[in-house]
Amino acid sequence: SPSPVTPSPTLKELIEELVNITQNQASLCNGSMVWSVNLTAGMYCAALESLINVSDCSAIQRTQRMLKALCSQKPAAGQISSERSRDTKIEVIQLVKNLLTYVRGVYRHGNFRGLNDIFEAQKIEWHEHHHHHHHH
């Protein structure tokens, strides 16, 4: 028989889980390091890609499952999952805390912008930054 479809976690549930695993914790997963993730529209997929490389860490298994469900929920978000800082590694707990901040913002304010709008904004910001450095 087909396996039951697991309902996608809500942002509220993800927040609760992230709070749960970071509360009063100085470290997670024995201080394992992962690639840093830019806070973009593809955060869930990018965070998952980064955290998926952490094995033997039961503390983040539920988070990994939730991110997997949220990432597969939006194909558009999956397409930009490579939005990572390949030159920066941070501790797992820092990545999880960054994710918590981002998700709280989305939960609270709603995803006001469409993905295209966000990319447009990022392009403009990159151009302004690039242009600025050209003149200094």
Partner: antibody, heavy 116, light 111 residues
Framework: ELTLQESGPGLVKPSQTLSLTCVVS?????????WDWIRQRPGRGLEWMGS?????WYNPAFQGRISITADTAKNQLSLQLSSVTTGDTAVYFC???????????WGQGTLVTVSS | QSVLTQPASVSGSLGQRVTISCSGR????????ANWYQQVPGKAPKLLVS???NRPSGVPDRFSASNSANSATLTITGLQAEDEADYYC???????????FGGGTQLTVLG
């Protein structure tokens, strides 16, 4: 009509803890909304301090010395800010945050002066 | 210094149209847009327009807001004397992990 009313001592000594209460009337303090504290220092802009909801969270700028709690039975919100300095002299507002709207209800604010 | 930049002051004559800008970045306005508040000196701020364009009942349709890329703009048409106040934009910043406000803009209505 929902109303929010802040109260607390108008004068606090440096290094002490500032304690304020926000009483909500005409509605309930529930986790359907987020209930925030925002302050405004003299001649300055608005500064978010923290939010009470299922998972209370704070502005990292205040982390370690702030506590926001709610007593849903009494329909009130509380703010505690420890180790205050003269830089904490401000008008303190409580406000309700509604998703997709913003801060739709505010208290009238209460002035707290930190001075010895 | 605020991460959301607003002009310190703007002025306009009665009946005129004025705009107040709020400049941010991708990690605040670029993602979450901005809400706008009006504050009369000595009073609490009052919500004018949300990032979704919602206006609370009681707020005249002379007040409107728009968002483009990493900035937001509040437009007031048919300026009236009672519009003289401070105006604040507000968003969420993922880098700071905090709700953020612009520094505020003082609007002066010229007689």
């Amino acid at each position: 009509e929902l109303t929010l009313q802040e109260s607390g001592p108008g004068l606090v000594k440096p290094s002490q803890t500032l304690s304020l209460t926000c009483v909500v009337s005409g509605g309930s303090v529930t986790n359907t909304y987020e209930w925030d504290w925002i302050r405004q220092r003299p001649g300055r802009g608005l500064e978010w301090m923290g939010s009470w909801t299922d998972n209370t969270w704070y502005n990292p700028a205040f982390q370690g010395r702030i506590s926001i709690t709610a007593d849903t039975a009494k329909n009130q919100l509380s703010l505690q800010l420890s180790s205050v300095t003269t830089g904490d002299t401000a008008v303190y507002f409580c406000a309700r945050w509604t998703k997709r709207w913003g801060y739709d209800y505010w208290g009238q604010g209460t002035l707290v002066t930190v001075s010895s | 210094q605020s991460v959301l930049t607003q002009p310190a002051s703007v002025s306009g004559s009665l009946g005129q149209r004025v705009t107040i800008s709020c400049s941010g970045r991708t990690n605040n306005i670029g993602y979450f847009g901005a809400n706008w508040y009006q504050q009369v000196p000595g009073k609490a701020p009052k919500l004018l327009v949300s990032s979704y364009g919602n206006r609370p009942s009681g707020v005249p349709d002379r007040f409107s807001a728009s968002n483009s890329a990493n900035s937001a703009t509040l437009t007031i048409t048919g300026l009236q004397a009672e519009d003289e106040a401070d105006y604040y934009c507000q968003s969420f910043d993922t880098t700071l992990g905090a709700v953020v406000f612009g520094g505020g803009t003082q609007l002066t209505v010229l007689g």
